[in-house]
Interface confidence: medium
Amino acid sequence: LIIGFGISGRHSITVTTVASAGNIGEDGILSCTFEPDIKLSDIVIQWLKEGVLGLVHEFKEGKDELSEQDEMFRGRTAVFADQVIVGNASLRLKNVQLTDAGTYKCYIITSKGKGNANLEYKTGAFSMPEVNVDYNASSETLRCEAPRWFPQPTVVWASQVDQGANFSEVSNTSFELNSENVTMKVVSVLYNVTINNTYSCMIENDIAKATGDIKVTESEIKRRSHLQLLNSKAS
């Protein structure tokens, strides 16, 4: 927890942020909570960003005050107005851009006092991988595909049966730039697979880690995938 010391005037209140990541082109959330106030009109929320002259967003007297908002955020920010009264100052950021990455400050004023906390926001691209059997290949082959990643991730294969085995010699990974020239499609092929085994394709960069599993038996194929953001930690 970061308490807003160092601001002269009223008492300090506790403001809490959570470091998070935004997926380019999608909407993101910059998380911030504070000790709530009973009166909405007494709450002021300010979002600032390092390297931006002017505010990212301001909410006060029950509404947005955006007349002096920096151009790069115009039309892209909103708070959850109905949740401010219960202490939610989180900022919704529409159409996340690579340049939105950086350090933000959530600055809160209420009748109880003032406080602030910083938040590290990373941006990139991440997506769920899908693993399929490649029936076009001459030998038993698995194909792992994920449509959007940035920065370029690493891809590692693993298997339940051969735990600890290094599959780099029997796999081939390629990265294909998508049409917007930032994100890339990840394709990794694993050769010489055996049935009655579960294989995992793990894709990871400094923002996210995603895994696609496939279980191949003589009678069926089962798939499962999940994605985890790596830098979500509270301040």
Partner: antibody
């Protein structure tokens, strides 16, 4: 376009308190996304930041003057004020109020001054 | 505190000629995480308050003529007036807003030769 106007006595005796007020017109001091500050300029010399205030009352002071400075705000009058105690001849200067367009670096709120008052000369002399 | 040192203290330039003012900071005002220089330039005409010209070392404030340009990075910065006009006679100040307290240079007086 925002306008700022300083007012207060032009002559203050040594050891007394210098008091100035800045009135902001064209726009409300409490409904904009700006901070407000005081800067001074001794005759024929450079500029020195004194301190900054937000409409809520949050203040940031120059460490070199912190023990003697108080900046306050009166949103009902659209004004903010400067008090500088125990003045000496070294405090003789043109005092400006200004609007601060804020940014943040390493967690500290700071910025550039985009609109200034005309300034008022305060002479410290007995 | 970061000390800002300007050079020269004054310069005289013919109308239509280029004027160049330098500003050096005692420590870098370049923030590596966003690659921005936290430096501004102001113009102060006789009997008037300062006027913001440039911020982020090279971004012109709205309404400032394009004959004014800023350059430099880290600790060394330059304000250039590409073609001096009579109305440019003034004292010019640099200011760092990288760390608190914000500090100004001592000023450079620009006159017509």
């Amino acid at each position: 376009q925002v306008q700022l106007q300083e007012s207060g006595p032009g002559l203050v005796k040594p050891s007394e308190t210098l008091s100035l007020t800045c009135t902001v017109s064209t726009g409300s001091i409490s409904s904009s996304s700006y901070y407000w500050g005081w800067i001074r300029q001794p005759p024929g010399k450079g500029l020195e930041w004194i301190g900054t205030i937000y409409f809520s009352g949050s203040t940031y002071y120059n460490p070199s003057l912190k023990s003697r400075v108080t900046i306050s705000v009166d949103t009902s009058k659209n004004q903010f004020s400067l008090k500088l105690t125990s003045v000496t001849a070294a405090d003789t200067a043109v005092y400006y109020c200004a609007r601060l367009r804020v940014t943040m670096v390493r967690g500290v709120i700071i910025g550039v001054f985009d609109f200034w008052g005309q300034g008022t000369l305060v002479t410290v002399s007995s | 505190d970061i000390v800002m040192t300007q050079s020269p203290d004054s310069l005289a330039v013919s109308l239509g000629e280029r004027a160049t003012i330098n500003c050096k900071s005692s420590q870098s005002v370049l923030y590596s995480s966003n690659n921005k220089n936290y430096l501004a330039w102001y113009q102060q005409k006789p009997g008037q308050p300062p006027k913001l010209l440039i911020y982020w070392a090279s971004t012109r404030e709205s309404g400032v003529p394009d004959r004014f340009s800023g350059s430099g990075s880290g600790t060394d910065f330059t304000l250039t007036i590409s073609s001096l006009q009579a109305e440019d006679v003034a004292v010019y100040y640099c200011q760092q807003y990288y760390s608190t307290p914000p500090t100004f240079g001592q000023g450079t007086k620009v006159e017509i030769k």
